[in-house]
Interface confidence: low
Amino acid sequence: QAAPFPELCSYTWEAVDTKNNVLYKINICGSVDIVQCGPSSAVCMHLLKTRTYHSVGDSVLRSATRSLLEFNTTVSCDQQGTNHRVQSSIAFLCGKTLGTPEFVTATECVHYFEWRTTAACKKDIFKANKEVPCYVFDEELRKHDLNPLIKLSGAYLVDDSDPDTSLFINVCRDIDTLRDPGSQLRACPPGTAACLVRGHQAFDVGQPRDGLKVVRKDRLVLSYVREEAGKLDFCDGHSPAVTITFVCPSERREGTIPKLTAKSNCRYEIEWITEYACHRDYLESKTCSLSGEQQDVSIDLTPLAQSGGSSYISDGKEYLFYLNVCGETEIQFCNKKQAAVCQVKKSDTSQVKAAGRYHNQTLRYSDGDLTLIYFGGDECSSGFQRMSVINFECNKTAGNDGKGTPVFTGEVDCTYFFTWDTEYACVHHHHHH
């Protein structure tokens, strides 16, 4: 039986049930390399409290569809006296990066995971030449996720003092020059995640090989190497390599750009101070507020919720967008789709799409940017579920009683972007990290 998602096969992935202190190791094509779970375990559960291991999915007992992967076991479980078997169930959804398996819940018999990944898309438009896992759990089982930094097109320019060269990098995947052929990047070889531009020439100085690693709680490392044997003539016989160290800052701050800290014989060391290197709970909330000791800030967007069936309306040329954020009020136009953002075609108002649902909500404050994300909307032809990204700006003189109003700024591959100036986006900082 062929592997259902070959792009995900090269790695053992991790997911965590934070509440119960459980670490899962997942290998969807082979078996995880953990002796205590046996030779054929595809999903191994490590109960940290009791220091025990249990296989909750056997690679031999795999069944797959395009969007669901199930691993059964021969272990009985008692679910209201019936003779069920322990199993793991992974639901796959189309995403724009390789993504991460997320633990959803576990019943007595079934361990449920959800995974938004390019591997599950109907079309190949989001697939990279080369991409590696871009998240890691620290020793306290807190997730550090750099997926939001991954560029689907273009690259980051590294800050260095050399006027003759420019070093461009992407995070965890190669630079896609076809989708966004910037003049400097056009010459970059396919597959490169670190591209050195000198004059009109561009050189591959590193490709992703291994996933993100954690070296200390607040320092993550990504290494790129040049796979081909052919040496570059300006590298004094050495093979090029790039090491990017992502550093979680000690207190809240605006974003910075990656900086070159050392360079010798085509070995480039880059340091990037970014809050994306911090653990995810520091950056994100499933509600419309971020506050408390953990986040170092106080943000509350719940006053933006509309009641009584009214919505914010944003004009998108061909479409009108109806938004109702931070609540669970149905948008009247949206046919009980549980939409937080609803897209209606002006020329045919029967064409209604959910562009993100209110129970699929993430509020993120990172590197000075406040973003509210709604995902899980109606599918596009690629299989990607429509989503909306609302970028908030603090404006203490916003109209509409300080609430302001969302403005549609554009769409890229079924992701809809809005900006919203409001007094409720004015962030109050605490100073203790």
Partner: nanobody, 116 residues
Framework: DVQLVESGGGLVQPGGSLRLSCAAS????????MDWYRQAPGKQREWVAT???????TYADSVKGRFTISRDNAKNTVYLQMNSLRPEDTAVYYC??????????WGQGTLVTVSS
């Protein structure tokens, strides 16, 4: 005393709606994963929906898009909003609290009957 008390069940016509409530006492509600299960006459108890303490919501395929689970931590209550009800949704609905510390706690159940 730790307990869960469900309410809101009753008789409803096909296509109608009901909202079930599950009030918790004696536990730190926000630390618990809350589940709804149901048991139809002569059948085994089946899982319906989960609201993890950190916000994840997940639903059985049979109710996805029709049922919504939510919670009010201030009221120590979890809700199950049930829309577009069908005769096959007829069952006793139970809520369950799971925490890393305590054993699972079950409510006594509330009967939902969908019939014309």
């Amino acid at each position: 005393d730790v307990q869960l008390v469900e309410s809101g069940g009753g008789l409803v016509q096909p296509g109608g709606s009901l909202r079930l409530s599950c009030a918790a006492s004696g536990i730190i509600f926000s630390d618990n994963r809350m589940d709804w299960y149901r048991q139809a006459p002569g059948k085994q108890r089946e899982w319906v929906a989960t609201l993890a303490s950190y916000g994840w919501k997940t639903y059985a395929d049979s109710v996805k898009g029709r049922f919504t689970i939510s919670r009010d931590n201030a009221k120590n209550t979890v809700y199950l909003q049930m829309n577009s009800l069908r005769p096959e949704d007829t069952a006793v609905y139970y809520c369950k609290a799971s925490s890393p510390v305590l054993n699972d706690i079950w409510g006594q159940g509330t009967l939902v009957t969908v019939s014309s």
